[in-house]
């Protein structure tokens, strides 16, 4: 299968690597701009320089390009608990991450939130917390896992999944309820 090429990719493929086809004259191949710069003016003719300008503060280009504008630097989302790992430069976007003992929960491909790694109280660590995954806990007897926290079986309602894990405890609770005082 041949991948579908957009008009821009088709035009670019006519020129050798590192060059792009002049938008007004398809017989001219202009040199692409280096990362950290953007296209101000196309080259006037073959073998002549493309007019590239450096990105202004707050913007960047991370690869060679013929973009008319630099890309805006990303901002770390404070309300998502993100912190800035490295600031934006003309040739690299801001890098955002999480604090120590936190993991990234991705809501979508590029949007993540920082959450604290579970400590597995009333349980043991089965798998340690990683950059993109919370700790996996195994609960002690008398506790069941609910949203990655070990909760006492006394909080297990009959309708919930925990009944299998907490069956002896539930029977005991039921037993004490049934045996009324005389």
């Amino acid at each position: 299968l041949v991948p579908h090429l957009g008009d821009r990719e088709k035009r670019d493929s006519v020129c050798p690597q590192g060059k792009y086809i002049h938008p007004q004259n398809n017989s001219i191949c202009c040199t692409k701009c280096h990362k950290g710069t953007y296209l101000y003016n196309d080259c006037p003719g073959p073998g002549q320089d493309t007019d590239c300008r450096e990105c202004e503060s707050g913007s960047f280009t991370a690869s060679e390009n013929h973009l008319r504008h630099c890309l805006s630097c990303s901002k770390c989302r404070k309300e998502m608990g993100q912190v800035e790992i490295s600031s934006c430069t003309v040739d690299r976007d801001t890098v955002c991450g999480c604090r120590k003992n936190q993991y990234r929960h991705y809501w979508s491909e590029n949007l993540f939130q920082c959450f604290n790694c579970s400590l597995c109280l009333n349980g043991t660590v089965h798998l340690s917390c990683q950059e993109k995954q919370n700790t996996v806990c195994t609960c002690h007897a008398g506790f069941f896992l609910r949203e990655n926290e070990c909760v006492s079986c006394s909080n297990c309602k009959k309708s919930l999944e925990c009944t299998k894990l907490c069956l002896p405890q539930i029977e005991n609770v039921k037993g004490t309820e049934d045996s009324g005082t005389t």
Partner: nanobody, 119 residues
Framework: QVQLQESGGGLVQAGGPLRLSCAAS????????MGWFRQAPGKEREFVAA????????YYADSVKGRFTISRDNAKNTVYLQMNSLKPEDTAVYYC????????????WGQGTQVTVSS
């Protein structure tokens, strides 16, 4: 155009309950995780709670765990925030947001709904 409309805010006494609603105007609502955030005067916007697209997973800020419950009704394109045992420090403007990078920009957020908890 994505539009979110929060409602249900108001003045409530400490210890009381309040239920916020967030209605979305687009059909693919059920494909996205949703979140509630709040902003108190002079403070930065902070996360309150979030819910996965299906409603199967929920997440809460430590400050509201055990008191607030997030839920959703995909048939009604609505996400809810049930707030119990309210405290004066819960006073803020509450906003809902779509948790997807293409729709998360503040331009897509609603106007918010004011919650005031009196002591």
């Amino acid at each position: 155009q994505v539009q979110l409309q929060e409602s249900g805010g108001g003045l409530v006494q400490a210890g009381g309950p309040l239920r916020l609603s967030c209605a979305a105007s687009w059909r693919t609502f059920s494909s996205y995780a949703m979140g509630w955030f709040r902003q108190a005067p002079g403070k930065e916007r902070e996360f309150v709670a979030a819910i996965s697209w299906s409603g199967g997973s929920t997440y809460y800020a430590d400050s509201v765990k055990g008191r607030f419950t997030i839920s959703r009704d995909n048939a009604k394109n609505t996400v809810y925030l049930q707030m119990n045992s309210l405290k004066p420090e819960d006073t803020a403007v509450y906003y809902c947001a779509v948790l997807h990078e293409d729709l998360y920009e503040y331009d897509y957020w609603g106007q918010g709904t004011q919650v005031t908890v009196s002591s």
